[in-house]
């Protein structure tokens, strides 16, 4: 009896694992084995596919074959008993194009109100992704074990910290990788769960802000208790993208080591141009807090996000404010080529009650003022980029008197 060729061959590639699956064409014939050949582009001869010779099942693994993953390959299969079937040719394919990204490895660390997630590619030193190792981004789904309500977090890198969690609570998460350059989305990792610890005695510092004064950076934060010492550390932001790297070499800012106030001042030349992460920790001598949330700090934006300069034209019931580019030393205006929002605070000179206007325009009207009254105005600029949520310091206050009545035209 003539053996029929096997049919419906499927090639599954996950990371560096190459799996072939096929259907027997004749279930009634026993003791049949199957063998594959392969052919590279531009070659006439067929080569035996190692790992896929004389296979009794309908699945084989040819991961050991050292292929150029960017080169097209053709496969053929036949059934064998006493005689052999004709060859069945599989459509040619490029391994890289066909490959799926496997589940990443996930390693969790818990704090009282935060979880640190370390993510690395599922296949170490993968051949398939050798040129793309630094291009992986990850997304995750996290939920409280007790509620199951899912939150998705997109576009994270190999180390990510989730804040504002509840103490003594079990959280579960799963992670998948993506190679956006190749339009590839991976498969999810198994679910990993971890319980946050009991609440720490000392909370971490909050609301960290960086501003520029003269040639210095001023770093400020809020803290719940008095008589504490603080330390500040920095890290190059790009290091968080480094796959498989679990050691983050946070560096001390020398002028911000063991400071006793909720701010520290350090020279701008501490940092070269770049994007950094900053974090602050509190200590009372016996205990230390966990580290604060990490803030992103871009020297380019920070250095030039100076307080706006403005002129006031006074009317009887309003001020017209004209915002101009801030001046550098030497009185040259600073070119700011990113969109800004302006926050204008004004108050009656004799009162503490402040009012606020937020405007994107550079000419702003402050309405509903009383005639012949001294009002003071200060302003600051904010970047409109959510990721680099930066603010300048406030300008010095400028005080002006409104005109007498009936001069509003």
């Amino acid at each position: 009896k003539n053996l029929k060729s096997p049919q419906k061959v499927e090639v599954d590639i996950i990371d560096d694992n190459f799996i072939l699956r096929w259907n027997r064409s004749d279930e009634s014939v026993g003791n049949v084995t199957f063998s594959f050949d392969y052919q590279k582009t531009g070659m006439d001869n067929w080569i035996k596919l190692s790992g896929c010779q004389n296979i009794t099942s309908t699945k084989c693994n040819f991961s050991s074959l050292k292929l150029n993953v960017y080169e097209e390959i053709k496969l053929r299969i036949r059934a064998e008993k006493e005689n052999t079937s004709s060859w069945y040719e599989v459509d040619s394919f490029t391994p890289f194009r066909k490959a799926q990204i496997g589940p990443p490895e996930v390693h969790l660390e818990a704090e009282d109100k935060a979880i640190v997630i370390h993510i690395s590619p599922g296949t170490k030193d993968s051949v398939m992704w050798a040129l793309d190792g630094l291009s992986f981004t990850y997304s995750l789904v996290i939920w409280k074990n007790s509620s199951g309500v899912e939150e998705r977090i997109e576009n994270i890198y190999s180390r990510h910290k989730i804040y504002k969690l509840s103490p003594e609570t079990t959280y579960c998460l799963k992670v998948k990788a993506a190679l956006l350059t190749s339009w590839k989305i991976g498969v999810y990792s198994p679910v990993h769960c971890i319980k946050t610890t009991v609440e720490n005695e000392l909370p971490p510092p909050e609301n960290i802000e960086v501003s520029v004064q003269n040639q210095n950076y001023v770093l400020k934060w809020d803290y719940t208790y008095a008589n504490m010492t603080f330390q500040v550390q920095w890290l190059h932001a790009f290091l968080k993208r480094n796959p498989g790297n679990h050691l983050y070499k946070w560096k001390q800012i020398p002028d911000c080591e063991n400071v006793k106030t909720t701010q520290c001042v350090f020279p701008q030349n501490v940092f070269q141009k770049g994007i950094y992460l900053l974090r602050v920790q509190a200590s009372d001598g016996n205990n230390t807090s966990f580290w604060s949330e990490e803030i992103k700090f871009d020297t380019e934006i920070q250095a030039f996000l100076l307080p706006p300069v403005f002129n006031i034209r006074s009317l009887s019931d309003s001020f017209h404010i004209y915002i101009g580019a801030p001046k550098q030393s030497g009185n040259t205006p600073v070119i700011q080529d990113y969109p800004l929002i302006y926050e204008i605070i004004f108050w009656e000179n004799t009162s503490n009650a402040e009012r606020k206007i937020i405007e994107k325009k550079t000419d702003v009207t402050v309405p509903n003022l009383k005639p012949l009254t001294v009002y003071c105005v200060k302003a600051r600029a904010h970047t409109m980029d959510e990721k680099l949520n930066k603010s300048s310091v406030f300008s010095d206050a400028v005080c002006e008197k409104t005109k007498p009545g009936n001069t509003s035209k």
Epitope: H107, E109, D112, T197, E201, N245, L247, K249, F290
Partner: antibody, heavy 117, light 105 residues
């Protein structure tokens, strides 16, 4: 294969100084912290300090501040521990170890230092 | 400074037993704790990191647990080659516990 090869046993006199070495292979020390740990006879492990070989930044346990100096030579992938003003209390086995972020994953075989007149 | 305390200096066990070595941190350290095994005349070896993750090549009879201030290394089905000293470490401050020696009954 990752290896940390330490210098041989040393016998030195009280008051003297000594420099122990830890030559590594199979990785670039710039990518890790390198630590030194000592262990006195029948005692536990005691952390001395560490270096970031990439920029030479060091950190020491308070007890070893002024006693220990850690350096690194990235061209030879070697970390060093210098101990000064030695006393019999410094007699111990000294280990170098590599830090991958969550533990010391590779250790040298240890150098036995004996301080005796 | 963070202090890691291993209250039991010695523990007696028999082959096949289950034994738990404990370690207490002087303050909340999250899960940043590693466990090491040291046999006489040898360098320490990593068993557990991040409180509960088994280091590669470590037999699955070694299990780490705990968070905050209380941590445990459990060896189920103790083997004769497990007779050694065990150290915990808080790896952000690098502080080691005093060690617990596992002996045969």
């Amino acid at each position: 294969e990752v290896q940390l090869q330490q210098s041989g046993a040393d016998l030195v006199k009280p008051g003297a100084s000594v420099k122990l070495s830890c030559t590594t292979s199979g990785f670039n020390i710039k990518d890790y912290y390198m630590h030194w740990v000592n262990q006195r006879t029948e005692q536990g492990l005691e952390w001395i300090g560490r270096i970031d070989p990439e920029d030479g930044e060091t950190k020491y346990a308070p007890k070893f501040q002024g006693k220990a100096t850690i350096t690194a030579d990235t061209s030879s992938n070697t970390a060093y521990l210098q101990l000064s003003s030695l006393t019999s209390e410094d007699t111990a086995v000294y280990y170098c170890a590599r830090d991958w972020g969550h533990s010391f994953d590779y250790w040298g075989q240890g150098t036995t230092l004996t301080v005796s007149s | 400074d963070i202090v890691m305390t291993q209250s039991q200096k010695f523990m007696s066990t028999s082959v096949g037993d289950r034994v738990s070595v404990t370690c207490k941190a002087s303050q909340n350290v999250g899960t940043t704790v590693a466990w090491y095994q040291q046999k006489p005349g040898q360098s320490p070896k990593t068993l557990i990191y991040s409180a509960s993750y088994r280091y590669s090549g470590v037999p699955d009879r070694f299990t780490g647990s705990g968070s905050g201030t209380d941590f445990t290394l459990t060896i189920s089905n103790v083997q004769s080659e497990d007779l050694a000293e065990y150290f915990c470490q808080q790896y952000n401050s690098y502080t080691f516990g005093g060690g617990t020696k596992l002996e045969m009954k």
